[in-house]
């Protein structure tokens, strides 16, 4: 058992049938001795006296608020959550697996530059009872601060039958350099409680890895005299990294006509603008990616070519 | 130590090219020894993150562009006295500026052929014949130190006499190969804003 | 935003068997564990079964362990509960649950409750 924060407590519980759990022993916050009795929840069902309490904890209807009280009047609470592991693996049933890059993806984060700012994001099927805290660092051994905020709520889907809520969170890392080597990996750790349950997630990477650029801005055509080319141009996105002759982007420019069956034009391109034969109800498409180091491609910026 | 004596090449650039083609080199290289050693410790995830050419070179520091030296963090770990002296900020362009800069990449690029040298020496002893070093590879790295053209003493090669453990070779190549892509992306950042200014 | 329908309920024979089913719908109901609850005429409510949303998990109250199975099929979004050797003290309502909480035997624990289906078995 462990404090996750005041009068909260967490209980690991290694769970199959017929497990005898785990023994706890509660102690009423009080100077008192004599005449205390202990309660579960709304309950008035006493559950024994005395200023320890023991109890057996198999499952989550042995978790919940204790109280001990003396003569009608509530000295101390106690909240027991319940973290069960089964079959050696600790459950991971309040965040559903996103299976993007890799299966046991429950979250997943992105930065659109090297400022050490980034945004990590996970889904539940769960509507309510539901609370996240977010801690990271970089490096566990020797932890440099990361300051996160709030998780919120950040979206919401329905699929067919599923409905699905997307939390997210931004940290800052405290002191970071856009121009430095990582060697040490960010750390991200969230805790998960949904009404009696707590579970952990974290996840490991290098912002060097997490990198998606926004999408080029000011994408625009001028038409080239006696002809069907156009000439493309575009702006690297405010929000990426300076100087940009430093922090460069590659970019792939697309010409998609209206239907997704007809054959698509790509051109790559380090410079902010390109020649391309532009089609009758086609549009032209610019994505961004990081020039050195492969990370993920921007969303497309799209105009029509008419 | 003293830093050799820097004559950079005037028209800067024929570095970009071969940065260019330096992080073409170690990034395909990379892949191969992932794709080869798929049984081995050799994605980013596994291996320690271990940089030979720490507290050795400052290259990060050394060429840090002239507008990210007003952020504080970038200028934490710096030793470099000129980082201090407000006229070498100002006249951030000056050859003395630059020499530090590409004296620094031309230490890293020294310092990693000796180490990949080594272990192709040991990985050709390999009865199983696995992985070698990409000739490319080597090759690229020559070419873009004779291009910075600083005139430095030659290191010998390191030599072994004992019997070389082929699973730890491996693990290191995997983990200088990481370390040398990173370090091939500055050089490559580097020789862009340089080619920009 | 969960429903869910019991049936299977009947007359039997102590010593006989009794399958229950239990169809849920709604939203993310495959990511509900499931349970049965009996409450016989003028008693609480009490736990039977329960079985964890991936269906690889089951839990028992000692009253029925050895009897009773628990099962589901997330393809047909249905819970079963198969019923042998019953005795006349199995005589109850059953109800089917579905909640968030694996396992728990405690009625509070579960956020949505069936209907109910009677199960009746004379000696």
């Known amino acids: 058992i462990w404090e996750l924060k005041k009068d909260v407590y967490v209980v690991e519980l290694d769970w199959y049938p017929d497990a005898p759990g785990e023994m706890v022993v509660l102690t009423c916050d009080t100077p008192e001795e004599d005449g205390i009795t202990w309660t579960l929840d709304q309950s008035s069902e006493v559950l024994g006296s005395g200023k320890t309490l023991t109890i057996q904890v198999k499952e989550f209807g042995d978790a919940g608020q204790y109280t001990c009280h003396k003569g009608g009047e509530v000295l101390s609470h106690s909240l027991l959550l319940l973290h069960k592991k089964e079959d050696g693996i600790w459950s991971t049933d309040i965040l559903k697996d996103q299976k993007e890059p890799k299966n046991k993806t429950f979250l997943r984060c992105e930065a659109k530059n090297y400022s050490g700012r980034f945004t990590c994001w996970w889904l539940t099927t769960i509507s309510t009872d539901l609370t996240f805290s977010v801690k990271s660092s970089r490096g566990s051994s020797d932890p440099q601060g990361v300051t996160c905020g709030a998780a919120t709520l950040s979206a919401e889907r329905v699929r067919g039958d599923n409905k699905e809520y997307e939390y997210s969170v931004e940290c800052q890392e405290d002191s970071a350099c856009p121009a430095a080597e990582e060697s040490l990996p960010i750390e991200v750790m969230v805790d998960a409680v949904h009404k009696l349950k707590y579970e952990n997630y974290t996840s490991s990477f290098f912002i060097r890895d997490i990198i998606k650029p926004d999408p080029p801005k000011n994408l625009q055509l001028k038409p080239l005299k006696n002809s069907r080319q156009v000439e493309v141009s575009w702006e690297y996105p405010d929000t990426w990294s300076t100087p940009h002759s430093y922090f460069s982007l590659t970019f792939c420019v697309q010409v998609q006509g209206k239907s997704k069956r007809e054959k698509k034009d790509r051109v790559f391109t380090d410079k902010t603008s390109a020649t391309v034969i532009c089609r009758k109800n086609a549009s032209i498409s610019v994505r961004a990616q990081d020039r050195y180091y492969s990370s993920s491609w921007s969303e497309w910026a799209s105009v029509p070519c008419s | 130590r003293n830093l050799p004596v820097a004559t950079p090449d005037p028209g800067m650039f024929p570095c970009l090219h071969h940065s260019q083609n330096l992080l073409r080199a170690v990034s395909n290289m990379l892949q191969k020894a992932r794709q080869t050693l798929e049984f081995y410790p050799c994605t980013s995830e596994e291996i320690d993150h271990e940089d030979i050419t720490k507290d050795k070179t400052s290259t990060v520091e050394a060429c840090l562009p002239l507008e990210l030296t007003k952020n504080e963090s970038c200028l934490n770990s710096r030793e470099t006295s000129f980082i201090t002296n407000g006229s070498c900020l100002a006249s951030r362009k000056t050859s003395f500026m630059m020499a530090l800069c590409l004296s620094s990449i031309y230490e890293d690029l020294k310092m990693y052929q000796v180490e990949f040298k080594t272990m192709n020496a040991k990985l050709l002893m390999d009865p199983k014949r696995q992985i070698f070093l990409d000739q490319n590879m080597l090759a690229v790295i020559d070419e873009l130190m004779q291009a910075l053209n600083f005139n430095s003493e030659t290191v010998p090669q390191k030599s072994s006499l004992e019997e070389p453990d082929f699973y730890k070779t491996k693990i290191k190549l995997c983990i200088l190969l990481h370390a040398f892509r990173i370090r091939a992306v500055t050089i490559d950042r580097v020789m862009s804003y340089l080619n920009a200014s | 935003e969960v429903q869910l329908v019991e049936s299977g309920g009947g007359v039997v024979q102590a010593g006989e068997s009794l399958r229950l089913s239990c169809a849920a719908s709604?939203?993310?109901?495959?990511?509900?564990?499931m349970g049965w609850f009996r409450q016989a005429p003028g008693m609480e409510r009490e736990f039977a079964a329960a079985?964890?949303?991936?269906?690889?998990?089951?839990y028992y109250a000692d009253s029925v362990k050895g009897r009773f199975t628990i099962s589901r099929d997330n393809a047909k979004n249905t819970v079963y509960l198969q019923m042998s050797s019953l005795k006349p003290e199995d005589t109850a309502v059953y109800y089917c649950?579905?909640?968030?909480?694996?396992?728990?035997?405690?009625?509070?624990?579960?956020?949505?409750w069936g209907q109910g289906t009677q199960v009746t078995v004379s000696s």
């Open positions: 649950a579905a909640g968030r909480l694996y396992p728990s035997s405690r009625s509070r624990d579960y956020d949505y």
């Open positions: 709604g939203y993310n109901v495959k990511d509900y564990e």
């Open positions: 079985i964890s949303w991936r269906g690889s998990s089951t």
